[in-house]
């Protein structure tokens, strides 16, 4: 009876996500058969989050909208380890929007999920950010410095990275 009600709960939770994510990839968390963590297929997973590389070329606003209709946000990078994971799936000749912007052009950077912007956990390329008209952040590869962040005009179409919390069922 307990297992039956657990299954029913799982199915209703899966139905919630079905509109945008018809297929989920789930893994068992720890040793308890009842705890599964899932990411939409073909998203990748790292720690408690799922990531999707969007290859459509869109402005920052539309990239964020694209993530939001999938139940996600443009990526918020919290640690070097998280960035190191993300870059494994990126192409060196492309740039990708992050969920980081400076709407007023006053160098008050803010993350889309309201995570406080911490100067000590940023990975700007040297000399960046460097232009008050460039109010959105991308991650890209520079041969001299490898992967890092750069400010860019928000209307320039780029690829993007979406991030959402893992789905626990």
């Amino acid at each position: 009876n307990f297992m039956y009600s657990k299954t029913v709960k799982r199915l209703s939770k899966l139905r919630e996500y079905q509109q945008y994510h018809p297929s989920l990839t789930c893994v068992m968390e720890g040793k308890d058969i009842e705890d599964w963590s899932c990411c939409p297929t073909p998203w990748t997973s790292f720690q408690s989050s799922c990531y999707f590389i969007s290859t459509g070329m869109q402005s920052w606003t539309k990239s964020q909208k694209n993530c939001s209709v999938m139940g996600a946000d443009l990526v918020v990078i919290n640690t070097r380890e998280e960035q190191d994971f993300i870059i494994q799936n990126l192409k060196r000749n492309s740039s990708y929007f992050l969920g980081l912007s400076d709407p007023g052009g006053r160098r008050h950077w803010q993350w889309v999920d309201q995570t406080p912007y911490n100067e000590n956990v940023t990975f700007w390329h040297s000399g960046e950010p460097n232009n008050l008209d460039e109010r959105c952040a991308i991650i890209n590869f520079r041969s001299s410095e490898e992967w890092g962040w750069n400010d860019i005009h928000c209307h320039v179409p780029q690829k993007s990275i979406c991030k959402m919390k893992k789905i626990y069922i």
Partner: antibody, heavy 118, light 107 residues
Framework: QVQLVQSGAEVKKPGASVKVSCKAS????????IHWVRQAPGQGLEWMGT????????SYNQKFKGRVTMTRDTSTSTVYMELSSLRSEDTAVYYC???????????WGQGTLVTVSS | DIQMTQSPSSLSASVGDRVTITCRAS??????LAWYQQKPGKAPKLLLY???TLAIGVPSRFSGSGSGTDYTLTISSLQPEDFATYYC?????????FGGGTKVEIK
């Protein structure tokens, strides 16, 4: 007032290149993207690509990739669109357009007719 | 790439008529749609953006509606200066494709 003034009509032979200019005035040139759109005689409109004059970043329609190059000269507030390996199907009026704050084309140049003929 | 299908390709109408032009996208463009008016030998002129927002200086007889993949431009009472070709264009992702155009002619 915002103005985009384009260079004059051109006649080119197949295989040649053409470079069309678009001089901006009446606003901060480096703050707004410039897009290029073309229109073949009696036909519809086709988006070619865009350039950000501040940093020089570009994004091209895949259809033209490898043939189109967009550049800018901030000292003269001018954007250039060069199309190479011209063929007769490239005969068209080429327009530059500014993308406004709302992310739509709010101002357009007057157009430049490029004729490709042997 | 998102394709834009505009209909009709042409129509004949009289001054005072109500005119409706439709535009269908091959995918959801989330209201990122513009409508333009073009007269012979001239550059297109922005009429509406975000599917329904009137551009500055555009008469209120022009209106737009729609969502998802289907959008409409309506001219409530056609004026002599409205005889022109109308285009829709999406701005969801590149390439920012246009519809094929609708030529509004005098009946």
């Amino acid at each position: 007032q915002v103005q985009l003034v384009q260079s004059g009509a051109e006649v080119k032979k197949p295989g040649a290149s053409v470079k069309v200019s678009c001089k901006a005035s009446g606003y901060t040139f480096t703050s707004y993207l410039i897009h290029w759109v073309r229109q073949a005689p009696g036909q519809g409109l086709e988006w070619m690509g865009t350039i950000y004059p501040g940093g020089g970043d570009t994004s091209y329609n895949q259809k033209f990739k490898g043939r189109v190059t967009m550049t800018r000269d901030t000292s003269t507030s001018t954007v250039y669109m060069e199309l190479s390996s011209l063929r007769s199907e490239d005969t068209a009026v080429y327009y530059c357009a500014r993308m406004g704050d709302n992310e739509y084309f709010d101002y357009w140049g007057q157009g430049t007719l490029v004729t490709v003929s042997s | 790439d998102i394709q834009m299908t505009q209909s009709p390709s042409s129509l004949s109408a009289s001054v005072g008529d109500r005119v409706t032009i439709t535009c269908r996208a091959s995918g959801n463009i989330h209201n990122y749609l513009a409508w333009y008016q073009q007269k012979p030998g001239k550059a297109p002129k922005l009429l509406l953006y975000d599917a329904e927002t009137l551009a500055i200086g555009v008469p209120s007889r022009f209106s737009g509606s729609g969502s998802g993949t289907d959008y409409t431009l309506t001219i409530s009472s056609l004026q002599p200066e409205d005889f022109a070709t109308y285009y829709c264009q999406h701005f969801w992702s590149t390439p920012y494709t246009f519809g094929g155009g609708t030529k509004v002619e005098i009946k």
